[in-house]
Interface confidence: low
Amino acid sequence: SVAHLTGNPRSRSIPLEWEDTYGTALISGVKYKKGGLVINEAGLYFVYSKVYFRGQSCNSQPLSHKVYMRNFKYPGDLVLMEEKKLNYCTTGQIWAHSSYLGAVFNLTVADHLYVNISQLSLINFEESKTFFGLYKL
Amino acid sequence: SVAHLTGNPRSRSIPLEWEDTYGTALISGVKYKKGGLVINEAGLYFVYSKVYFRGQSCNSQPLSHKVYMRNFKYPGDLVLMEEKKLNYCTTGQIWAHSSYLGAVFNLTVADHLYVNISQLSLINFEESKTFFGLYKL
Amino acid sequence: SVAHLTGNPRSRSIPLEWEDTYGTALISGVKYKKGGLVINEAGLYFVYSKVYFRGQSCNSQPLSHKVYMRNFKYPGDLVLMEEKKLNYCTTGQIWAHSSYLGAVFNLTVADHLYVNISQLSLINFEESKTFFGLYKL
C-alpha cells in the first residue's frame, strides 16, 4: 500500500484536497476520498507531508500544518503530527517557508488520514512543493 | 536498492556532487555518477535530501533546494520535490537554516536523480548536515 | 524492527527521554533504554526525528537538534544527522519553529541512538510535535 498525493490548487476547504492521478501522484492499495487517504489494510505505515507556505507581505501570522487521523467508528480526530511556525519572517516583506512532517504509525482498516493547514490562501500547490503520502512498511 | 550520500565540500558546480564511500555514506543496487543516483531497477522509491544553508551576513537571498530527475531518453528535467526560503533571517547577521525533502516516487531504469541548490557558497557540506538518499520500497 | 517514540515532558536531561508506550508511541524489535533506541538486529534503518522548539521572547539563541549513535564497544559518539538554526526569529517576540531529520543508516547490534538538543526548556513535548523513530528497511 502506497500513495503520493500532490497539491491541488482547486482546494477550497479544510482538510486539503489532493491530486491522486496526474504528474508525480500515485496511489495503490489505499483509497483517496474527499481529501483523505483511507486505509484498506491494517499495519505500520510511514506517513509524510510537506506544505509550502508563502505570502506577499509578512505579518508572521501563525502557520499550522497537521496530519490527523479519523476513524468513523470513533469520535474525534487524532493529530498524528503537527508543525507550527510563529515569528518566522521580517514584517512586511515577501516570504516563503515550508513545513515537513514524517513518521511511523500503526493504522487500522477504515482509518482516514487528512492534512490540515492554517490558511489556504498562503499555500503554493505545485506538485513538487506541497504533497502528502504514505507507504506500508 | 539503497543509497545515502553525504555532503562533498569539493562540489564546485550544480548539480551537487556527493560522497558515496566514506563515513556514513552507503550505496547498493543503484549507481552514483557525476552527482546523480542512477536507478538500476524500476519501482517505488522513498527519496530524501537535506541541505544545510548558512551565511555570514543575512540578506535573505532566496534559498532553493530541489530534487529533480532526468532520463536521457526524454528531454528536460522533472522536479520531484523542492523547497524555497525567502525572508528567513534578520539582515546583516550570521544565519543558518536547513531544508528537508522526502517522498515516494515511481522511478524507472536509467532515471538519474540530482540535487540542485541556489548558491553553492551557502552550503555546509558536513556529512550530518547535508545529504541525499533513497531506498526501494 | 520499528519504533516511534514521542515527546516526554518529564525529560530533565540530555539526551532526551521519550514515551515508548502510550498514545501514538510504538516499539517492536528494538529496545528503549534511558533515552536511547538499542539495535537488536544489524541492517539498514531509516531513522527520523522531529523537535518542536518555542519560546516567549526570541533572542535567536542557537537551536541544535542531533541524532547521534553510540556503541559501547567504541569510544565517542557519531553524529548521524543534525540541524542548527541561527537567526530565525525577530527579537523579543513569541516564536516557534521545528526541525526535522530523516535518513538511512547502516546500524549494528548494540548501537544506541539518541537525540540531543541545545536547550530543554525550549521544547514542546506534545506527541504530535516532538518524536523520534526508526524502522528496518
Epitope: 508563502r54 516583506q93 515577501i94 | 532566496p62 524555497k84 525567502l86 541556489s118 | -
Partner: antibody, heavy 119, light 106 residues
Framework: QVQLVESGGGVVQPGRSLRLSCAAS????????IHWVRQAPGKGLEWVAV????????FYADSVKGRFTISRDNSKNTLYLQMNSLRAEDTAVYYC????????????WGQGTLVTVSS | DIQMTQSPSTLSASVGDRVTITCRAS??????LAWYQQKPGKAPKFLIY???SLESGVPSRFSGSGSGTEFTLTISSLQPDDFATYYC????????FGQGTRLEIK
C-alpha cells in the same frame, strides 16, 4: 555589461491586450528576480509586478492584479508582461528592472517601452 | 499600503550647494529604503540601498541617512550632472515609491 532591453510597446485601444518583452544580457538571468515598473507621462514610478528567478512565484500590484501576467523564459533570457483588459490609466513607460536582493530594490533598468491606451 | 512622501517636490539649487531631500513613510519601514536618480527620457539609476549604503560606482558626494519613518538624501556639493529627479522607494512591504523631487538649476 548588464543590459535589459524592453520591446512590444505601442498604441492600443481600451479593453485590448498587449505583450511586452524584456531581453536580458550580461548576467546570469536565471538567478535573478525581475520586476516591471511603470511611469505614467509626467508622473512618478509605480511598481507593477515581480517574478521569482525560476518563474515559480509571481506577485502583482493591486492595480494590475487579475489583468496582467508576468512570466519569463530562462532559456531565452527573456521576461514578459502580458497585459489584458487595458485601461487608459495603464498608459505609461514600462521598465523591466533587475532585483538586487530578495525582491527589494533594482540595480539595473531597461530603457523602457511606451504603452499608450487610447481610443 | 505604505505611502512615501518626498519633500520638497521641486528644489532649486546651484552648483557647489549642499542639498537635502526628505522622504517620509506613512509607517515605520526600518531601514528598508532605496534612492534613485532619473534624468528626462532615461531610466532611473540606482544610488543607495538600506537607507545609507552607497551603491558601487556612485560618487561619494551622495549619502543617505535615517530609519523608521524619516529619511534624507544629501548631495554634499552639487555637480552639473546631478540636476535630475530623485525618488525614494520603500521595500518593507511590497514596493512603493515617493512622488519624486525635481532638482533644478537656480
Amino acid at each position: 555589461q548588464v543590459q535589459l532591453v524592453e520591446s512590444g510597446g505601442g498604441v492600443v485601444q481600451p479593453g485590448r491586450s498587449l505583450r511586452l518583452s524584456c531581453a536580458a544580457s550580461g548576467f546570469t538571468f536565471s538567478t535573478y528576480g525581475i520586476h516591471w515598473v511603470r511611469q505614467a507621462p509626467g508622473k512618478g514610478l509605480e511598481w507593477v509586478a515581480v517574478i521569482w528567478y525560476d518563474g515559480s512565484d509571481k506577485f502583482y500590484a493591486d492595480s494590475v492584479k487579475g489583468r496582467f501576467t508576468i512570466s519569463r523564459d530562462n532559456s531565452k533570457n527573456t521576461l514578459y508582461l502580458q497585459m489584458n483588459s487595458l485601461r487608459a490609466e495603464d498608459t505609461a513607460v514600462y521598465y523591466c528592472a533587475r532585483d538586487r536582493d530578495n525582491w527589494n530594490y533594482f540595480d539595473y533598468w531597461g530603457q523602457g517601452t511606451l504603452v499608450t491606451v487610447s481610443s | 499600503d505604505i505611502q512615501m512622501t518626498q519633500s520638497p517636490s521641486t528644489l532649486s539649487a546651484s552648483v557647489g550647494d549642499r542639498v537635502t531631500i526628505t522622504c517620509r513613510a506613512s509607517q515605520s519601514i526600518s531601514s528598508w529604503l532605496a534612492w534613485y536618480q532619473q534624468k528626462p527620457g532615461k531610466a532611473p539609476k540606482f544610488l543607495i540601498y538600506q537607507a545609507s549604503s552607497l551603491e558601487s560606482g556612485v560618487p561619494s558626494r551622495f549619502s543617505g541617512s535615517g530609519s523608521g519613518t524619516e529619511f534624507t538624501l544629501t548631495i554634499s556639493s552639487l555637480q552639473p550632472d546631478d540636476f535630475a529627479t530623485y525618488y525614494c522607494q520603500q521595500y518593507n512591504s511590497y514596493i512603493t515609491f515617493g512622488q519624486g523631487t525635481r532638482l533644478e538649476i537656480k
